[in-house]
């Protein structure tokens, strides 16, 4: 019944959050990504 749907919704939310985290991890902002190399490169 309703309990099953609620559980499924929570489960889907967790999966979506994990997917979002994975995407954010891969596609970091240029500013953040630059921190992993010579940080002053390209800075004003």
């Amino acid at each position: 019944g309703g309990g099953g749907s609620k559980h499924k919704c929570v489960q889907n939310s967790l999966v979506n959050n994990e997917t979002l985290e994975s995407i954010m991890n891969t596609l970091e902002s240029e500013e953040d990504f630059r921190k992993y190399f010579y940080y002053l490169e390209g800075s004003k």
Epitope: T26, D32, F33, K35, Y36, F37, Y38, Y39, L40, E41
Partner: antibody, heavy 118, light 112 residues
Framework: QVQVVESGGGVVQPGRSLRLSCAAS????????MHWVRQAPGKGLEWVTV????????NYADSVKGRFTISRDNSKNTLYLQMNSLRAEDTAMYYC???????????WGQGTMVTVSS | DIVMTQTPLSSPVTLGQPASISCRSS???????????LSWLQQRPGQPPRLLIY???NRFSGVPDRFSGSGAGTDFTLKISRVEADDVGVYYC?????????FGPGTKVDIK
């Protein structure tokens, strides 16, 4: 001259821990992201982890996530790799590399060998 | 993960002759800033890796102009115009466009 020197390798039993160090000199350490790359005997190169210039951002390969921790002390110009729950497949030469201009690994150390064996 | 492949895996060459190594990525290495972060590394026997080329075609300081890089998108090439004895070793392409950073399997260059 610009260089990085790794230390701390050795023979360790599976499940145990080890901490590697990388001492940097000849450049402004705090301006550079730093990486660890490993190479199993007779095999190719595998990127392991990176830490941002200020230590605020870190990223790990899936193969070491949750077991290895990268850190740095900019006041000591030193990079660290804490390796826990070591496995036989972690046996490798571990290289410290500087993340330089052009998003390339421009300075490499001579490496320190880690052997995980019972 | 971006998978890097190299061909050939072994390349016996004649001293003074050219050599060419191909590298292909499983997806485009063009980053949102418009740059392509593909580099080439040389590893001589018993030595650590050494940077040769970054951003496809830029030679790192101290690298002889016998080495050149080219390519775009997913296909890249390292050329040695005239192979010298010092060039023996394994050559790796590497991408730093996207985490996790990945290397090609390496191409072993030796003298015939």
């Amino acid at each position: 001259q610009v260089q990085v020197v790794e230390s701390g390798g050795g023979v360790v039993q599976p499940g145990r821990s080890l901490r590697l160090s990388c001492a940097a000199s000849g450049f402004t350490f705090s301006n550079y992201g730093m990486h660890w790359v490993r190479q199993a005997p007779g095999k190719g190169l595998e990127w392991v982890t990176v830490i941002s210039y200020d230590g605020s951002n870190k990223n790990y390969a899936d193969s070491v996530k949750g077991r290895f921790t990268i850190s740095r002390d900019n006041s000591k110009n030193t990079l660290y790799l804490q390796m826990n729950s070591l496995r036989a497949e972690d046996t490798a030469m571990y290289y410290c590399a500087r993340g330089g201009s052009g998003f390339a690994f421009d300075i490499w150390g001579q490496g320190t060998m880690v052997t995980v064996s019972s | 993960d971006i998978v890097m492949t190299q061909t050939p895996l072994s390349s016996p060459v004649t001293l003074g002759q050219p050599a060419s190594i191909s590298c292909r990525s499983s997806q485009s290495l063009v980053r949102s800033d418009g740059n392509t972060y593909l580099s080439w590394l040389q590893q001589r026997p018993g030595q650590p890796p050494r940077l040769l080329i970054y951003k496809i075609s830029n030679r790192f300081s101290g690298v002889p102009d016998r080495f050149s890089g080219s390519g775009a998108g997913t296909d890249f090439t390292l050329k040695i115009s005239r192979v010298e004895a010092d060039d023996v070793g394994v050559y790796y392409c590497m991408q730093t466009t996207q985490f996790p950073f990945t290397f090609g399997p390496g191409t072993k260059v030796d003298i015939k």
